[in-house]
């Protein structure tokens, strides 16, 4: 919405724009207005940007008015929160940034018959971005001076220069995000995607075979398994086989059969032939032993002279028997040839989860960290390893230890600094966590441990000359008594500086006002109105630019009056034969100096900037990413050091590129996993991760690698009629009209006949940026004077 607040009004004499009094006649003595004051109210008209403001035409952005808010002079700066002096114009379209504002002060007649009368009017064309800050404007010419402030604010959840970017935080199944100060969605931890409703799966989860609906999860597709869903499930019953794809059973070396359970190398796997017998594979799971002399049996296990070959291992003694031989084993060994180490770990003697290691004729316990001793039956003292970092003491417990943390620390080893920042800092202060404490860093204008105190900038009584000090956040304002001005009321106001008196009139400063002593031909508060002598005095045409009039103001008794046929922007030059020419001021041309020269003809705005013609001047509205009087400077988008983790920044047009190092990815080298995050593509673009780069798919109206450049498409073909300049505004446009035209696309001819330029009942004929007066009988001249 567009908001306007009237701050003050000064209409010292209670006059109207036409020089009359608001409330009746003038006092014959001091020529001041008598009777009651003006009943002042304000009207506002907001419309599209016009380089030359025209009063007529529709208020295409809205209009409104205040009730009567005061008399001749009033100051409402102190009465904040009073809505009577505020006009709010809501808009349901994207804010175009550039605008024209007409503000008029009116006197209410309180009378159904008598119409209201205009006191003063102000116009302002400019550009304003949405902000909470007010912009103060002043109307300092004419019979009345007034001050007002304006701002444009976006509705809740709307962002951007056009208030057309919507972002409302949410945390439900539609999305899990907050909104940053630019209206971009910032996903909560564990969520991603344009709507932050796609869960970020467990790191390492196979993108092909795993997925998740909840953060940190990894659910496997049919046929896949493992923590990261990257291992295929082999065929059920597969023994000595693996898989590359689900349900395969690819046999390991020397295994065969559908389930890889047939041993093709029984000899190699089992080495069945004893006593130096030679083994031959004869088929799956089949073999044959060729025995050396003195041995027989399927596995050459029968020794014909048994003890000759020292069959008893590990210092066992051999005794020949009728069946062959018998071994008597040394301690710790068993089996027919004393080759089996007796398992001293059965039963397991290790306590408290200790792991038993079998030795020859004995065992050894490998204890968990909390236990010690031969069978892990003794409690270990964990405090000897000094595990406590920030602690008063370490206490050994059974199978554990306890760290008595110093204040401000927590965790098993007192190595986690407790976050003492729990929202104690007020007034948008930032909180710095300390050990066992915190510190509030106050924004300007606040003090106190919690920034709870508004610093009173009025405490030093800075206002001079009886000025009233008003304390505000991080500043103060002096409300000055009449006759003083300046930020400290240190200046004695000279109402004659700058001189308000026109047409060479002398200005006299008073305590709270000024007085203009007018030359004979002029009248009004500022001597701005030409007296109509022709009503009483006969006029004589001298030449096609001048008339002479009897006057007792000059020694010759004659006063010469120049024609205004050349309008406000030229001087009349008389030519022979009753003709004339116009000598135009700088910036104007045409027969009557009515055409503003197009200073944009030379296309001075570079890099796609739009040129807006002024009077003997021009202004460049730069494309995104450019600045300077001619849009010649590429804004350095690297100035904020956006590249993280050692990335190198390269400035582009309205964009930057990060050259990432050491495996970092993404627009700002912020991620190990993905090229995309919610800030990669601007203006609603969709980000696609393409492995070693990202790609933005831009919505209509935007282009560039990150959808950062507004397409000219909204201005192609030019929608602005009658020579209007088109300014791209996202997916929309604004027309800056040439003089004489108005409306959203400059299609309406400005009413050059407003307000009534033809005198003495002359009829006005409106043209394209010109008018002609058809005079009543007995009158002549360009304005029938």
């Amino acid at each position: 919405q567009f908001e306007l607040e009237i701050l003050s009004m000064q209409n010292v004499n209670g006059e109207l724009q036409n020089g009359n009094c608001c409330g009746g006649a003038r006092n014959p003595g001091d020529r001041k207005c008598t009777r009651d004051e003006c009943d002042t109210y304000f009207k506002v008209c907001l419309k599209e940007y016009q380089s030359r403001v025209t009063a007529g035409g529709p208020c295409s952005f809205g209009s409104g008015s205040t009730p009567v808010i005061g008399g001749n002079t009033f100051n409402l700066k102190a009465s904040r929160g009073n809505d009577r002096n505020r006009i709010v114009l809501p808009f349901s379209f994207a804010w175009p940034r550039s605008y024209t504002l007409l503000v008029e002060a009116w006197d209410s007649s309180n009378d159904t018959v008598q119409p209201d009368s205009i006191i003063e009017k102000a116009s302002h064309s400019g550009m304003i971005n949405p902000s909470r800050q007010w912009q103060t404007l002043k109307q300092n010419t004419g019979v009345a001076h007034f001050e007002y402030q304006i701002r444009v604010t976006c509705d809740d959840y709307y962002y951007g220069f056009g208030c057309n970017k919507f972002c409302r935080p949410r945390d439900d199944f539609f999305g899990h995000y907050a909104c940053d100060q630019n209206g971009n969605k910032t996903c909560m931890e564990g969520w991603m995607g344009p709507e932050c409703n796609r869960a970020i799966c467990r790191q390492g989860c196979s993108p092909k075979h795993g997925s998740c609906k909840l953060p940190g999860d990894c659910r496997c597709q049919y046929g896949w398994q493992g923590l990261y869903c990257d291992k295929c499930i082999p065929h059920p019953g597969c023994v000595h086989g693996i898989c590359n794809e689900p349900w395969q059973c690819l046999c390991e070396t020397n295994w065969g059969g559908q389930l890889c359970d047939k041993d093709l190398n029984y000899c190699g796997t089992h080495q069945p032939c004893l006593n130096g017998g030679t083994c031959s594979n004869t088929g799956p799971d089949k073999y044959q032993c060729s025995c050396p002399e003195g041995y027989s049996g399927p596995n050459c296990e029968i020794a014909e002279h048994a003890c000759l070959s020292d069959p008893c291992h590990n210092r066992g003694s051999c005794k020949e028997t009728s069946l062959g031989f018998e071994c008597e084993c040394s301690p710790g060994w068993t089996g027919p040839t004393c080759s089996t180490n007796i398992d001293d770990c059965s039963p397991n003697n290790c306590s408290h989860g200790g792991t038993c290691q079998d030795l020859v004729n004995g065992f050894k316990c490998v204890c968990p960290p909390q236990w010690t001793g031969k069978t892990c039956q003794l409690d270990a003292n964990e405090c000897e390893a000094k595990p406590c970092v920030n602690a008063k003491s370490c206490k050994n417990l059974i199978a554990s230890y306890y760290c008595d943390c110093l204040p401000g620390w927590m965790g098993q080893n007192c190595d986690i600094n407790i976050n003492d920042c729990l929202g104690q800092c007020q007034n948008d202060a930032s909180c710095r966590d300390l050990v066992n404490g915190y510190r509030c860093i106050c924004p300007p204008g606040y003090a106190g441990d919690h920034c709870e105190r508004d610093i009173d900038e009025c405490a030093s009584n800075p206002c001079l000359n009886g000025g009233h000090c008003q304390n505000e956040i991080n500043r103060f304002q002096c409300l000055c008594p009449t006759g003083f001005s300046g930020n400290l009321c240190q200046l004695d106001i000279d109402y004659c500086e700058p001189n308000p008196c026109q047409n060479g009139a002398q200005c006299y400063n008073r305590a709270s006002d000024y007085f203009c002593k007018c030359p004979e031909d002029y009248e009004g508060k500022n001597c701005s109105h030409l007296k109509d002598h022709c009503r009483t005095t006969p006029c004589e045409v001298i030449d096609s630019c001048t008339v002479a009039m009897a006057s007792n103001d000059t020694p010759e008794g004659v006063r010469y009056i120049s024609s205004n046929v050349c309008g406000p922007h030229g001087k009349c030059k008389s030519q022979s034969g009753g003709k004339f020419t116009c000598d135009c001021n700088k910036g104007f041309t045409g027969t009557y100096c009515h055409e503003n020269i197009n200073d944009c003809e030379s296309n001075p705005c570079r890099n796609g900037g739009t040129c807006i013609d002024g009077v003997n001047s021009y202004k460049c509205i730069c494309s995104d990413g450019w600045e300077g009087a001619y849009c010649e400077t590429n804004i350095n988008d690297c100035s904020q050091n956006p590249c993280h983790n050692g990335g190198t920044c390269r400035d582009l047009v309205n964009d930057f590129y990060c050259d990432c190092k050491n495996g970092w990815k993404g627009k700002t080298c912020h991620s190990r996993d993905s090229q995309c995050d919610e800030a990669t593509c601007n203006n609603g673009g969709t980000c696609y991760d393409e492995g070693d780069a990202f790609k933005c798919m831009c919505p209509g109206g935007w282009e560039g690698t990150t959808c950062n450049i507004a397409r000219n498409s909204s201005c192609l073909p030019n929608p602005c009629h009658n020579g209007g300049t088109c300014v791209v505004n996202g997916e929309s446009f604004t027309c800056v009209c040439k003089e004489g035209w108005e409306g959203p696309i400059c299609a309406q001819n400005t009413n050059d006949c407003s307000p009534h330029p033809c005198y003495n009942s002359g009829t006005c004929v409106d043209g394209d940026n010109w008018y002609r007066c058809e005079c009543a009988p007995g009158f002549a001249g360009p304005d029938c004077r």
């Epitope: 919507f166 935080p169 949410r170 439900d172 199944f173 539609f174 869960a199 609906k213 909840l214 940190g216």
Partner: antibody, heavy 119, light 107 residues
Framework: EVQLLESGGGLVQPGGSLRLSCAAS????????MSWVRQAPGKGLEWVSS????????YYADSVKGRFTISRDNSKNTLYLQMNSLRAEDTAVYYC????????????WGQGTLVTVSS | DIQMTQSPSSLSASVGDRVTITCRAS??????LNWYQQKPGKAPKLLIY???SLQSGVPSRFSGSGSGTDFTLTISSLQPEDFATYYC?????????FGQGTKVEIK
């Protein structure tokens, strides 16, 4: 006072269509996500569909996907459920419910409208 | 989809009793869990949202706790008007799912 009023229920043959409406009042309709939840006779609650406040995102239960369409008209403060290819197992009381933008709870419910699918 | 399992399916209690109903999710849902009360022929009514936040206008004898996969609804002192069916519901991800319900009857 928040009010949600469902209408459009009734008896319909299998394969037929029905359109349910939910008229909302007492809150800013365009600021809240809305949902349909149903309850078959003697059974528990079953979520059917949801639509976020601008109508840009919709979700459906697998059992109704492709047959039901949720929509809303923020200018009329009305939520709709277009039900096509109805089956006997769609017989239930259909409730409309509103959700604030945090945690996805259904903080207000309508009184429900009965849909009977039978030949 | 996330399965929600309530226990017990039904329970009998007397006025003044402390009643506890549990709800288990098939996978971690953080605190995105809501509890509803439904009386015969009426629409459900929200009691607790975000696992432990009491909906405005609900008596303080109702409380919720839990996080991750295990959640509890407690009625500290059962009142005559509390005899009803209670449902839990997860709201972190679509499809939204409800528990099968717990019927609290008069002993």
């Amino acid at each position: 006072e928040v009010q949600l009023l469902e209408s459009g229920g009734g008896l319909v043959q299998p394969g037929g269509s029905l359109r349910l409406s939910c008229a909302a009042s007492g809150f800013t309709f365009s600021s809240y996500a809305m949902s349909w939840v149903r309850q078959a006779p003697g059974k528990g609650l079953e979520w059917v569909s949801s639509i976020e406040q601008m109508g840009w995102q919709t979700y459906y239960a697998d059992s109704v996907k492709g047959r039901f369409t949720i929509s809303r008209d923020n200018s009329k403060n009305t939520l709709y459920l277009q039900m096509n290819s109805l089956r006997a197992e769609d017989t239930a009381v259909y409730y409309c419910a509103k959700s604030p933008p945090f945690f996805g709870q259904f903080d207000y419910w309508g009184q429900g409208t009965l849909v009977t699918v039978s030949s | 989809d996330i399965q929600m399992t309530q226990s017990p399916s039904s329970l009998s209690a007397s006025v003044g009793d402390r009643v506890t109903i549990t709800c288990r999710a098939s996978q971690s849902i953080s605190s995105y869990l809501n509890w509803y009360q439904q009386k015969p022929g009426k629409a459900p009514k929200l009691l607790i949202y975000a696992a432990s936040s009491l909906q405005s206008g609900v008596p303080s004898r109702f409380s919720g706790s839990g996080s991750g996969t295990d959640f509890t609804l407690t009625i500290s002192s059962l009142q005559p008007e509390d005899f009803a069916t209670y449902y839990c519901q997860q709201s972190v991800v679509a499809p939204l799912t409800f528990g099968q319900g717990t019927k609290v009857e008069i002993k």
